[in-house]
């Protein structure tokens, strides 16, 4: 009978929303496959000391360190971390294993260090050592992919110089426009670095690692498509590679393609051609213009000409530094309570921006869409008609941009009242900002029509709650009104609201809402 290793150490990485964290089950249901930490007997150590592979954890990640003891019967255990003993509750599974777990929720610097686990089984004692550190994501990078021609082959290599090593995939689509959205059935993904099929309509390369995903589209001029109303523009930074693909389809092979920069033919070695027959026996030709590392003098109009198609051009602009061009002046909007409305920012940027929309200290995902004129647009519609300040923030490697929006929702005032021994105050958040009146209710004026003008102090927009203005009015108490009911009314173009207050003794006062439209 040959012996199996008694101790198995595993790491379970929990997804952030994982409800199974900290729960035990007969055969633990885990959010992701447990990673074997290869617990090995420590050489030159007295007794049975096992050492697990070092564990690197992202800040705020949740993990479970787990030890499986393949030994029959009961075990007892103790965790020690930074000289403190931690409670240890083994459970036993259906595979006859003792299972000991240490859950670390939302990893922080203070939770990094050496975790020692002492296990006593019916037969032997074991010591298991885990070393947990925080992954240094400061060294992480995710760079936009770029293209290179494969040596001696008509193929493109996609490169992303990122840390950790990214997964590179080609995203191909053969239809037009909207149907080439990421999750469309027309989109084909190939998880490889080299692409040989370069005739497709839309070709992108994406790289992804722990920091996210970055994509680069192969800039294409299609001579069979009607040219855009504005000249397509391609921005590049000095030193970056330039790739433009010119594509044309014709009934037979009797046509040729050429590239010119500012009416001068491109030099040999700066272009290569490929051709193929399509399913309906028409000929597809593509001609690539490329410069491995652009300089300022590569700026200009690149024109693709064909003996059988009208020529088309693109303006290539080489910049020293990235940019974000947009108007940053703040914008105020006033809408009705059920009116459909979206904030939008139109910008031109290179490299592509990362952006967020923020409201009330909460960030929302930001989508951007390219327009035909070289501009992009980002819209935000998810405001749920909450008035206040909305912020659009965009950045790329070289530039930052912030734009403020204020949203006002037209609605009739709602009044809240409070009173103290010396004064009564009313507050309202209606828009447009309301005006105030105070009225005294007495025997002479049972309908509270007697207006109070003395001792009234109005503060318009004195309190900003996430950009939402609040108006208030305060009435200083005088002997003339003590013991009476008073009514404060806020009114704007959409209606009036009132609140009645009894001015008698200090303390909280009951008040009756009295809505008048």
């Amino acid at each position: 009978n040959q012996d199996l290793p008694v101790i198995k150490c595993v790491l379970i990485n929990h997804k952030n929303n994982d409800s199974s964290v900290g729960k035990s089950s007969s055969y633990p249901m885990v959010s992701e496959s447990p990673e074997d930490l290869g617990c090995a007997l420590r050489p030159q150590s007295s007794g049975t000391v096992y050492e697990a592979a070092a564990v690197e954890v992202d800040v705020s990640a949740s993990i479970t360190l787990q030890v499986l003891v393949d030994a029959p019967g009961n075990i007892s255990c103790l965790w020690v971390f930074k000289h403190s003993s931690l409670n240890c509750q083994p459970h036993f599974d259906l595979q006859n294993r003792g299972v000991v777990s240490m859950v670390i929720l939302k990893m922080t610097e203070t939770q990094a260090g050496e975790y020692l686990l002492f296990i006593q089984s019916e037969a032997t004692n074991y010591t298991i050592l885990f070393t947990v550190s925080i992954r240094n994501t400061l060294l992480y990078t995710l760079r936009r992919p770029y293209f290179r021609k494969m040596e001696n082959q008509d193929a493109l290599v996609c490169i992303s110089e990122s840390v950790p090593e990214p997964i590179v995939e080609w995203v191909l689509c053969d239809s037009q426009g909207e149907s080439c959205k990421e999750e469309s059935p027309a989109v084909v993904k190939k998880e490889e670095k080299v692409l040989h099929e370069l005739f497709g309509t839309d070709i992108r390369c994406c790289a992804r690692n722990e920091l996210g995903r970055e994509c680069t589209r192969l800039f294409t001029i299609d001579l069979n498509q009607t040219p855009q109303t504005t000249l397509p523009q391609l921005f590049l930074k000095v030193g970056e590679p330039l790739w433009i693909r010119c594509k044309a389809v014709h009934v037979n092979h009797g046509f040729g393609l050429t590239w010119e920069l500012e009416n001068k033919a491109l030099e040999e070695g700066n272009y290569f051609e490929m051709s193929t027959y399509s399913t309906n026996r028409t000929m597809i030709r593509i001609l690539f213009a490329f410069v491995s590392s652009v300089a300022r003098n590569d700026t200009g109009y690149y024109t693709c000409s064909s003996s059988k198609h009208p020529s088309q051009s693109a303006l290539v602009t080489i910049v020293e530094k990235g940019f974000i061009n947009a108007t940053n002046s703040s914008e105020d909007y006033e809408i009705d309570q059920y009116e459909e409305f979206c904030f939008s920012v139109r910008f031109k940027a290179y490299p592509q921006i990362r952006c967020t929309w923020t409201f009330s200290r909460k960030s929302f995902p930001c989508e951007q869409k390219g327009l035909d004129n070289g501009y992009s647009i980002s819209k935000f519609c998810n405001h749920k008609h909450q008035p206040g300040e909305y912020i659009f923030h965009a950045e790329n490697d070289d530039a930052q941009f912030t734009k403020m929006f204020t949203l006002n929702i037209r609605r009739k005032p709602q009044v809240l009242a409070e009173a103290s021994a010396s004064q009564a105050s009313c507050f309202s958040d209606g828009y447009p900002l309301p005006s105030w009146t105070w009225k005294k209710c007495s025997d002479k004026s049972p309908n509270c029509t007697e207006e109070i003008t003395e001792g009234v102090w109005n503060r318009k927009a004195n309190r900003k709650v996430f950009g939402q203005w609040v108006s208030s009015s305060t009435l200083n108490m005088s002997e003339a009104i003590k013991g009476f009911l008073v009514k404060c009314c806020a009114y704007n173009s959409l209606g009036t609201s009132c609140e009645t207050i009894l001015l008698n003794s200090p303390g909280p006062f009951p008040f009756i809402q009295d809505n008048i439209s």
């Epitope: 007969s26 496959s33 447990p34 393949d70 019967g73 459970h91 006859n96």
Partner: antibody, heavy 118, light 109 residues
Framework: EVQLVQSGGGLVQPGGSLRLSCAAS????????MSWVRQAPGKGLEWVSG????????GYADSVKGRFTISRDNAKNSLYLQMNSLRAEDTALYYC???????????WGQGTMVTVSS | QSVLTQPPSVSAAPGQKVTISCSGS????????VSWYQQVPGTAPKLLIY???KRPSGIPDRLSGSKSGTSATLGITGLQTGDEADYYC??????????FGGGTKLTVL
């Protein structure tokens, strides 16, 4: 000699109940997880239920969940399977098995036949 | 439908070598040990291999087991007529509990 001796099988009508027993000897029963495995006539093996040595972990196959209950009595070296709401598809030869190293079933009972038929 | 996939049958002449494959998933074979069982018709299953490649005492070294990723293999060399039986692979699944293959009938020609 290490062995598992089963009893309690028989013929039962659909909707009926039956309790299977498995008596262990020759090893420290209270230190090992145990399982029930069944085999329908002419078919393969199907794991039915399992229980850890201290009854702290219990598991069932989806096909029997809510109808079968596994239990053990370490003082009596015995494993049990209470089967309720029996169906025709529960007809099988039921084996009790000891769980050994690597989670393998290293000792098997002789099997007991359960026939569910009207 | 078994969680683990085995070929329904294999055959070889006496003295030959035969292999039986068993494929599963990352949550079954990928994360757990594989065991192999022999069942002669009319008898209870018998453990042949545990822990992917270990033999219990009394099991000859003609039998071997291996595991790679989410697949496992049982090998029998020097086939004998007494090896004719049904062979099952088994393991545990992180969410299903115990799981078996559908069984492979070994015929010695």
């Amino acid at each position: 000699e290490v062995q598992l001796v089963q009893s309690g099988g028989g013929l039962v009508q659909p909707g009926g109940s039956l309790r299977l027993s498995c008596a262990a000897s020759g090893f420290t029963f209270s230190s090992y997880a145990m399982s029930w495995v069944r085999q329908a006539p002419g078919k393969g093996l199907e794991w039915v239920s399992g229980i850890s040595w201290n009854s702290g972990s219990i598991g069932y196959a989806d096909s029997v969940k809510g109808r079968f209950t596994i239990s053990r009595d370490n003082a009596k070296n015995s494993l049990y399977l209470q089967m309720n709401s029996l169906r025709a598809e529960d007809t099988a030869l039921y084996y009790c098995a000891k769980v050994g190293g690597g989670g393998a079933f290293d000792i098997w009972g002789q099997g007991t036949m359960v026939t569910v038929s009207s | 439908q078994s969680v683990l996939t085995q070929p329904p049958s294999v055959s070889a002449a006496p003295g030959q070598k035969v292999t039986i494959s068993c494929s599963g998933s990352s949550s079954s074979i990928g994360d757990n040990y594989v065991s192999w069982y022999q069942q002669v018709p009319g008898t209870a299953p018998k453990l042949l291999i545990y822990g992917n490649n270990k033999r219990p005492s009394g099991i000859p070294d003609r039998l071997s087991g291996s595991k790679s990723g989410t697949s496992a293999t049982l090998g029998i060399t020097g086939l004998q007529t007494g090896d004719e039986a049904d062979y099952y692979c088994g393991t545990w699944d992180n969410s299903l509990g115990g799981v078996f293959g559908g069984g492979t009938k070994l015929t010695v020609l």
